[in-house]
Interface confidence: low
């Protein structure tokens, strides 16, 4: 029975030309979290094996950092990084929990950074 | 108990330089994963540069081709050397890592102050 549940940084906003923290967090199971995938759309971004630890698809490999934790870091924000995002948590014994992200890329300075880090 | 301890700042003029230290203790692991942080005065926290345990690193553009990243992992420490160091690089400098093998959770350090003035 899959009792977890995915809080992530929601719907959030960023300038054209910033970075921007993506970041999920799984709670409320005792899975092992075996695998995370970072996805946008339908292209791989990166993932984190709790294993092999991090690979970041070429593609975004001048762009995309990994970190904090399971969260991923994106820089030199273009509007075309406009969209969903998806964290996917591979668990055992639960299966895949998914958490949804989507994020808009604006032109100017009015962009309101819904997922800013705070110091802990 | 898990803890990270930055040292290394202080008052430099500009473009001088500075290393960073993060020591993590208390660790029954060795991070896979190690960051800096920074946060100015009236600014948000933002990231500076991550390291890998394989040795992949990332930077923040602002800082690419002045700070290096690395880090050791025998005595699971990373540093950060700063150089041609601005005014604009003044801030609290956060060392963060994972605190388990799922690496769920973050770990931040205390801080520690770079001041970049004449």
């Known amino acids: 029975m899959m009792t977890g549940t995915i809080e992530t940084t929601g719907n959030i906003s960023a300038e054209k030309g910033g970075s921007i923290i993506l970041q999920c967090h799984l709670s409320s199971t005792t899975a092992q979290v075996t695998q995370v995938n970072w996805e946008q759309q339908d292209q791989l971004l990166a993932i984190c094996n709790a294993d092999l630890g991090w690979h970041i698809s070429p593609s975004f490999k001048d762009r995309v950092a990994p970190g904090p934790g399971l969260g991923l870091t994106l820089q030199s924000l273009t509007v075309n990084d406009t969209g969903e995002y998806f964290c996917i948590y591979h668990t055992y014994p639960d299966g895949t929990y998914t958490g949804r992200i989507f994020l808009e890329v604006l032109e100017s300075s009015v962009a309101e950074h819904g997922a800013r880090f705070q110091i802990p | 108990e898990v803890q990270l301890v930055e040292s290394g700042g202080g008052l430099v003029q500009p473009g001088g330089s500075l290393r960073l230290s993060c020591a993590a203790s208390?660790?029954?692991?060795?991070?896979?994963?190690m960051g800096w942080f920074r946060q100015a005065p009236g600014k948000e926290r933002e990231w500076v540069a991550s390291?890998?345990?394989?040795?992949?690193?990332w930077y923040a553009d602002s800082v690419k081709g002045r700070f290096t990243i690395s880090a050791d992992n025998s005595k699971n420490t990373a540093y950060l050397q700063m150089n041609s160091l601005k005014p604009e690089d003044t801030a609290v400098y956060y060392c963060?890592?994972?605190?388990?093998?799922?690496?769920?959770?973050?770990?931040w350090g205390q801080g520690t102050l770079v001041t970049v003035s004449s």
């Open positions: 390291v890998l345990r394989g040795g992949y690193t």
């Open positions: 963060a890592t994972d605190r388990g093998p799922a690496m769920v959770f973050n770990l």
């Open positions: 208390g660790f029954t692991f060795s991070p896979s994963w």
